[in-house]
Interface confidence: low
């Protein structure tokens, strides 16, 4: 089938006092091979500080997955979610407040 770029959606939620969990979700992509990771100050975090979901079919012939990490509240501006799929890549910031961002990745 043809390549379908992912929709990338970054959300935040309170984890514990002074900490938040930031989650980056990619959905609606094909084929299933994807790189999704959190970066701090432009450099990927080590694997032991991130949690990944499985790459799962979403029922539409495309796939979905996620990556999350816990960060200190007030440090959000330093973190970005990096996505690479079928030779295309994009970077997505953590939203301020309780909002969330989602973007289609265009070729």
């Amino acid at each position: 089938g043809s390549t379908v770029p992912p929709m990338v959606n970054v959300t935040r939620s309170e984890a514990s006092e002074g900490n938040i969990t930031v989650t980056c979700r990619a959905s609606g992509f094909y084929p299933w091979n994807i790189t999704l990771s959190w970066r701090q100050d432009g450099v990927s975090l080590s694997h032991d500080t991130q949690q990944w979901g499985d790459v799962l079919p979403d029922g539409n012939g495309t796939y979905q997955t996620w990556v999350a990490t816990r960060i200190c509240q007030g440090e959000e501006q330093r973190f970005t979610c990096y996505m690479e799929h079928s030779g295309n890549h994009s970077t997505h910031p953590v939203p301020s407040g309780n909002s969330h961002h989602h973007h289609h990745h265009h070729h």
């Epitope: 701090q40 100050d41 432009g42 450099v43 080590s46 500080t49 200190c72 007030g74 440090e75 501006q77 330093r78 970005t80 970077t91 910031p93």
Partner: antibody
Framework: EVQLVQSGAEVKKPGASVKVSCKAS????????IYWVRQAPGQGLEWIGY????????IYNQQFKDRVTITADTSTSTAYLELSSLRSEDTAVYYC???????????WGQGTLVTVSS | EIVLTQSPATLSLSPGERATLSCSAS???????LHWYQQKPGQAPRLLIY???NLASGIPARFSGSGSGTDFTLTISSLEPEDFAVYYC?????????FGQGTKVEIK
């Protein structure tokens, strides 16, 4: 081999502006941030700010926010630091550095001496 | 702002001796975010140790780092002539990124 090559020494009068360049080579310029740090004569190191060349995000040390502008040109893999309204206490060596794992400074430019004198 | 205080300010030792440099933080830092640099006169700093205890590329094994929380240590097991320099600790855990004021290791 990763290299950061900075522009040459500058002598400026108080109130003037200076723009220092930092040309990166040996790695993908957009894959790491560029930090700027300064060191006054005989003093320690002070972080000024950084730019993420991939998305153009810039974060400043609040102490410098009003007088500093950090930019980057991805087509030439060059980062720039501009400091305005110069004062004598801005006399320092200005360094660019590449971001490494966990916000360290893994490669450094050779430094640019900026002298502010009337 | 996290303030890093290094001690002593100056350490006078002879080649072959052991050097112990301290870095104390005003608030707790994850050990992942504490780094050490060496600077020689007229040169840019160079990364020595990252994440408290990991040697940067090309750094000899006589250098080691340890610590947690607010107290961190850089140890040079046996000083070589080229080790006489200024050493800085740096934290990357919160903004602004900050450095200690430095410890000068000089020849006695």
């Amino acid at each position: 081999e990763v290299q950061l090559v900075q522009s040459g020494a500058e002598v400026k009068k108080p109130g003037a502006s200076v723009k220092v360049s930092c040309k990166a080579s040996g790695y993908a310029f957009t894959s790491n941030n560029i930090y700027w740090v300064r060191q006054a004569p005989g003093q320690g190191l002070e972080w000024i700010g950084y730019i993420d060349p991939y998305i153009g995000r810039i974060i400043y040390n609040q102490q410098f926010k009003d007088r500093v502008t950090i930019t980057a040109d991805t087509s030439t893999s060059t980062a720039y630091l501009e400091l305005s309204s110069l004062r004598s206490e801005d006399t320092a060596v200005y360094y660019c550095s590449r971001s490494g794992e966990r916000s360290n400074f893994d490669y450094w430019g050779q430094g640019t001496l900026v002298t502010v004198s009337s | 702002e996290i303030v890093l205080t290094q001690s002593p300010a100056t350490l006078s030792l002879s080649p072959g001796e052991r050097a112990t440099l301290s870095c104390s933080a005003s608030s707790s830092i994850s050990s992942n975010y504490l780094h050490w640099y060496q600077q020689k006169p007229g040169q840019a700093p160079r990364l020595l140790i990252y994440r408290t205890s990991n040697l940067a590329s090309g750094i000899p094994a006589r250098f080691s780092g340890s610590g947690s929380g607010t107290d961190f240590t850089l140890t040079i097991s046996s000083l070589e002539p080229e080790d006489f320099a200024v050493y800085y600790c740096q934290q990357g855990g919160s903004l602004p990124l900050t450095f200690g004021q430095g410890t000068k290791v000089e020849i006695k």
